[in-house]
Amino acid sequence: EPTMYGEILSPNYPQAYPSEVEKSWDIEVPEGYGIHLYFTHLDIELSENCAYDSVQIISGDTEEGRLCGQRSSNNPHSPIVEEFQVPYNKLQVIFKSDFSNEERFTGFAAYYVATDINECTDFVDVPCSHFCNNFIGGYFCSCPPEYFLHDDMKNCGVNCSGDVFTALIGEIASPNYPKPYPENSRCEYQIRLEKGFQVVVTLRREDFDVEAADSAGNCLDSLVFVAGDRQFGPYCGHGFPGPLNIETKSNALDIIFQTDLTGQKKGWKLRYHGDPMPCPKEDTPNSVWEPAKAKYVFRDVVQITCLDGFEVVEGRVGATSFYSTCQSNGKWSNSKLKCQPVDCGIPESIENGKVEDPESTLFGSVIRYTCEEPYYYMENGGGGEYHCAGNGSWVNEVLGPELPKCVPVCGVPREPFEEKQRIIGGSDADIKNFPWQVFFDNPWAGGALINEYWVLTAAHVVEGNREPTMYVGSTSVQTSRLAKSKMLTPEHVFIHPGWKLLEVPEGRTNFDNDIALVRLKDPVKMGPTVSPICLPGTSSDYNLMDGDLGLISGWGRTEKRDRAVRLKAARLPVAPLRKCKEVKVEKPTADAEAYVFTPNMICAGGEKGMDSCKGDSGGAFAVQDPNDKTKFYAAGLVSWGPQCGTYGLYTRVKNYVDWIMKTMQENSTPRED
């Protein structure tokens, strides 16, 4: 507890002090006071530097004195032999004695009193910036007119802060400008403009005179500009050392002017104005800016249009242009949007064809569609080459965005038919010689595949069974073979309207218009054993002449069997119709004259007993295409005959091409493109 005065006596005083003693006293007087310590008696063993016995006076970390020996007063009117005055309110006194004393020493008597200190004069560091006023136990600071005392109660400054400038143009100067600015002041000015405008500060060199920097380059008085996280300055010296035009890139600016106690100069004056915030002219690749300007500022709007083949992708939507606005923060809106190369995506697959996996699907990439050769070809031309166009579509020079169509190649057998070994007027054949050959199991008959959805046959084959089961791709019609072959399911049977339906078909004598089409439920996949036959052209090139050769095939009756196990075939010449008329009907169901012969029929055969027979009905009479020797077309369909092994009658397909085409067109399912 601090006291105003006190007494300190050495141990056993006034008797001799003991050996080997160390004792300390902590003196504390109230704050605002100093301590006056004085000794009235001093009798301590003398030694050099008071090394043996001593009384030590310590203030803080400083030794104020170390005493030993005997002292007496110099002043007859005063008992004081030694005294200490400290301007602090704490003091420590330490007494030490060693292990022996040569004589008897009585020690010391000392007193302390609290004394007033003059804070205004007693210290090196002046406590007040302007006026210091001392009183007993303390001091206070005061200020000259127009200055005020800061919260620290020590520093005086002028009231130069708190001004907020919101006008788009203005002038700000240091206090008293051009008279010397106040010392020991911190002036803060705030410029706050509306968003989208940046504060631009302009100064003239001659309008700036602030106390220069010290030898280390630190400004003693300084002017600083702070805009967000950017700082300009500190500036000081004679003549403005910074840029005369400061673009702050911010709508908010704080101006801080800090002065110390000394060296006042005239100060500074500046002008400011609000500039619409500029946005950088950014380099956005693969695009054009409209309007094109040298400089863009707040609220400017540009349309950024991608070059051909480039697009803006935002989410899943692609666009060719976008708008960008110069924002209040000096940044462009939609700055994340970029013009990227158009991506045409993975090209669509096509039926019976393929497209190589593209290395790239971006603008300018090229892909090639091919058909599954040699069974399919590209119907709609264009070569199959597509490039990724600017609109994001794969485009062909001929077809545009339309996909190529792979359609079956017709009339080309994988292996040509060769009459190897003569078997009952015909030869063993392989289905690869007649890949268009269709087998009907009820009734036992044939047909010809003319495209992936249609089978051509004789009307009399399907008139009694409108849901025939058909097979393709097998040479043998043994059950185990058919189980492995392709079964075709009919969707609808179309019999020629000119075909006369009878109550008792067995007694038929009129086979005119013996032609029918079977529409299939599913498309047939072509390959080496399944491939369509062509239809005849409508030109006169496709008119048959007597002697023209054609091929017939089927699993019909042979000399040995009612039904052939393996496909049989024969090459027959076209004959005049009268040759067929002349042959006597084997098992007539009516008069010979009752049998009808029309121009819709072709007569063929008569050579070496080669002929079609029961069970071959509906199969094609295949003739080499006069305009393309690699192909065969269905000139006829096995229809009827007077007698097996002589001449046979075939439906003249050329006469029905229009009906065939019309029926197929009217009953086609639109392709799912």
Epitope: V477, T479, S480, L482, A483, K560
Partner: antibody, heavy 119, light 107 residues
Framework: QVQLVQSGAEVKKPGASVKVSCKVS????????MHWVRQAPGKGLEWMGT????????IYAQKFQGRVTMTEDTSTDTAYMELSSLRSEDTAVYYC????????????WGQGTLVTVSS | DIQMTQSPSTLSASVGDRVTITCRAS??????LAWYQQKPGKAPKLLIY???SLESGVPSRFSGSGSGTEFTLTISSLQPDDFATYYC?????????FGQGTKVEIK
């Protein structure tokens, strides 16, 4: 109709082999697929194998693989089935059967040959 | 191999009865199924093929139905000549397999 005439009954000792013949008449063997089926006394029918003329290969049931050989002599229109390493459970009637056409599994059956395996 | 399970194994019936025999395949065989009749000491005789097609010369009282894995043979009115053993057969693959047989005997 094709007729199939098989060789007569045989009695064999275990470990021996038996060769059953099947003569085709009314058609040529080259036109046909010949299958062999057996039936143990009082038991069901069991398919043994066939010659596939399309592929030119003989297909055997897994059970008989390595013990059965099916051959054909087209000059005499005769098919043969030889079963080796006979055991008592091979006692059965062995049938030759021609495959049918267009959904019919079988066309003609031989009269059957009884093979008895007994020591 | 495809397994064929026939039921029942024995069936006692009288002349004039309607008789049904079922056959189940271990996997789908579409319609590649046949039914045979066999009399003692004779070779089997084809009755039905393609699951439901009647072989020529077979009386119309015999009928077949089913596809996939479930098949039936029906004799609409049993005749004295019909007492025999009946087998189903699958032929969807070269490894033909037969059912174990159903013996139809006089009650």
């Amino acid at each position: 109709q094709v007729q199939l005439v098989q060789s007569g009954a045989e009695v064999k000792k275990p470990g021996a082999s038996v060769k059953v013949s099947c003569k085709v008449s009314g058609d040529t063997l080259t036109e046909l697929s010949m299958h062999w089926v057996r039936q143990a006394p009082g038991k069901g029918l069991e398919w043994m194998g066939t010659f596939d003329p399309e592929e030119g290969e003989t297909i055997y049931a897994q059970k008989f693989q390595g013990r059965v050989t099916m051959t054909e002599d087209t000059s005499t229109d005769t098919a043969y089935m030889e079963l080796s390493s006979l055991r008592s459970e091979d006692t059965a009637v062995y049938y030759c059967v021609t495959e049918g056409l267009a959904w019919r599994p079988t066309d003609s059956w031989g009269q059957g040959t009884l093979v008895t395996v007994s020591s | 191999d495809i397994q064929m399970t026939q039921s029942p194994s024995t069936l006692s019936a009288s002349v004039g009865d309607r008789v049904t025999i079922t056959c189940r395949a271990s996997q789908s065989i579409s319609s590649w199924l046949a039914w045979y009749q066999q009399k003692p000491g004779k070779a089997p005789k084809l009755l039905i093929y393609k699951a439901s097609s009647l072989e020529s010369g077979v009386p119309s009282r015999f009928s077949g139905s089913g596809s996939g894995t479930e098949f039936t043979l029906t004799i609409s009115s049993l005749q004295p000549d019909d007492f025999a053993t009946y087998y189903c057969q699958q032929y969807s693959s070269y490894a033909w397999t037969f059912g174990q047989g159903t013996k139809v005997e006089i009650k």
